[in-house]
Amino acid sequence: MAVTACQGLGFVVSLIGIAGIIAATCMDQWSTQDLYNNPVTAVFNYQGLWRSCVRESSGFTECRGYFTLLGLPAMLQAVRALMIVGIVLGAIGLLVSIFALKCIRIGSMEDSAKANMTLTSGIMFIVSGLCAIAGVSVFANMLVTNFWMSTANMYTGMGGMVQTVQTRYTFGAALFVGWVAGGLTLIGGVMMCIACRGLAPEETNYKAVSYHASGHSVAYKPGGFKASTGFGSNTKNKKIYDGGARTEDEVQSYPSKHDYV
């Protein structure tokens, strides 16, 4: 039950995260005009990954796409690439995780297959989240660098005597959406990976009979050791009980989410 909940929650969190990454990638407000030096501007500039926009005093907003690939800064191209890779990986991860969900039955799919798929989607979500966080962080770093550069050259002479203030840009809403969405996708991926360990199937469990030797509290169990599944090998040689004869210490021996550490 706990495994299903962890897997389901991981899926939902990742879904929200990927939706956020898509939203952030499409948003126009990656950078917005810094109003500190010109709070009374009637013309407000903001830029996204795909186009730049200007809101005028009339309330009219005009956006113009970046109709060039070669003329764009390499960093912007890198951010675009990271966000797209994040979306693609996230989308594939979502597709895989839908089939991996424990609550969904597809034919006679083995638990081991579901476990593998859960792990795969989890890793995809983690990489997707990291791509988004990296993309947003690279863009933020680019903004900070440009901000201080333009502050240093705040006043550029125009026509000799007249001074014109250079437009500076600061963090836009899309950056915060991207950071949060990337984080959620990452958390969702980790949850999927955790859930995967609980989905790992056990080999045939024989009904165990406990034999009590006088003066000893050792329970003998033929074939009672958990076989390694590849997902969190059983290094502790825990005994598996399957409702057979019970010992006094069996109360603490039921398999639980803590058994797969």
């Epitope: 009219f60 007249v162 203030v165």
Partner: antibody, heavy 115, light 113 residues
């Protein structure tokens, strides 16, 4: 076509208030800011401020800020300009304007302040 | 506040001749975000509201005859009427559309010589 129709002329006493309306039609009222401009007799144009019907935001010329209130009613696509504590130098034609580059203007409302 | 200074205050030009009105702003009206200058030109005839002629310093509004043209950048702008017509007699205003409060020039009265 885009139209801005303003309320009729007003005669007020000093110290009173006046509320001028501007009814918009032919465009999405919430998409553009409605600006108000004052023109005293034989004088030039003076920007008073704007109201953004979409979000209720506004911006005022500091010269008028303490006496002017700009509001809008999106249900009837109408913007209002209320000027309080009227003085004789408030006698002027008041225009509402909207659109890119103030492409559309109301016909103007003459407010006369006289004792 | 940005101060808009128009010159001359009045201008008399013969029909068919070129008329030039200048406008100077105390600060640049150039927006680096889209490389445009935020200056507007209006024409106002007696008893009428102003009529938009030019926005963004050089973009003619729809329906405005092509004899009207705007030019300039930064702080210096010009409205040119290439061939004056009788119906062009009016007062012309320039306006800062870049920074609040939006400010207007004092106006230039254009007459026929």
């Amino acid at each position: 076509q885009v139209q801005l129709v303003q309320s009729g002329a007003e005669v007020k006493k000093p110290g009173a208030s006046v509320k001028v309306s501007c009814k918009a039609s032919g465009f999405t009222f919430t998409s553009y800011n409605i600006h108000w401009v004052k023109q005293a007799p034989g004088q030039g144009l003076e920007w008073m401020g704007y109201i953004s019907p979409g979000n209720g935001g506004s911006n005022y010329n500091l010269k008028f800020k303490d006496r002017v209130t700009l509001t809008s009613d999106t249900s009837i696509s109408t913007a209002y300009m209320e000027l309080s504590r009227l003085r004789s130098d408030d006698t002027a034609v008041y225009y509402c304007a909207t659109g890119r580059g103030f492409a559309y203007w109301g016909q103007g409302t003459l407010v006369t302040v006289s004792s | 506040d940005i101060v808009m200074t128009q010159s001359p205050d009045s201008l008399a030009v013969s029909l068919g001749e070129r008329a030039t009105i200048n406008c100077k702003s105390s600060q640049s009206l150039f927006n680096s975000g889209n490389q445009k200058n935020y200056l507007i030109w209006y024409q106002q005839k007696p008893g009428q509201p102003p009529k938009l002629l030019i926005y963004r310093a050089s973009t003619r509004d729809s329906g405005v005859p092509d004899r009207f043209s705007g030019s300039g950048s930064g702080t210096d702008f010009t409205l040119t009427i290439s061939s004056l017509q009788a119906e062009d007699v009016a007062v012309y205003y320039c306006q800062n559309d870049y920074s609040y409060p939006l400010t207007f020039g004092g106006g230039t009265k254009l007459e026929i010589k």
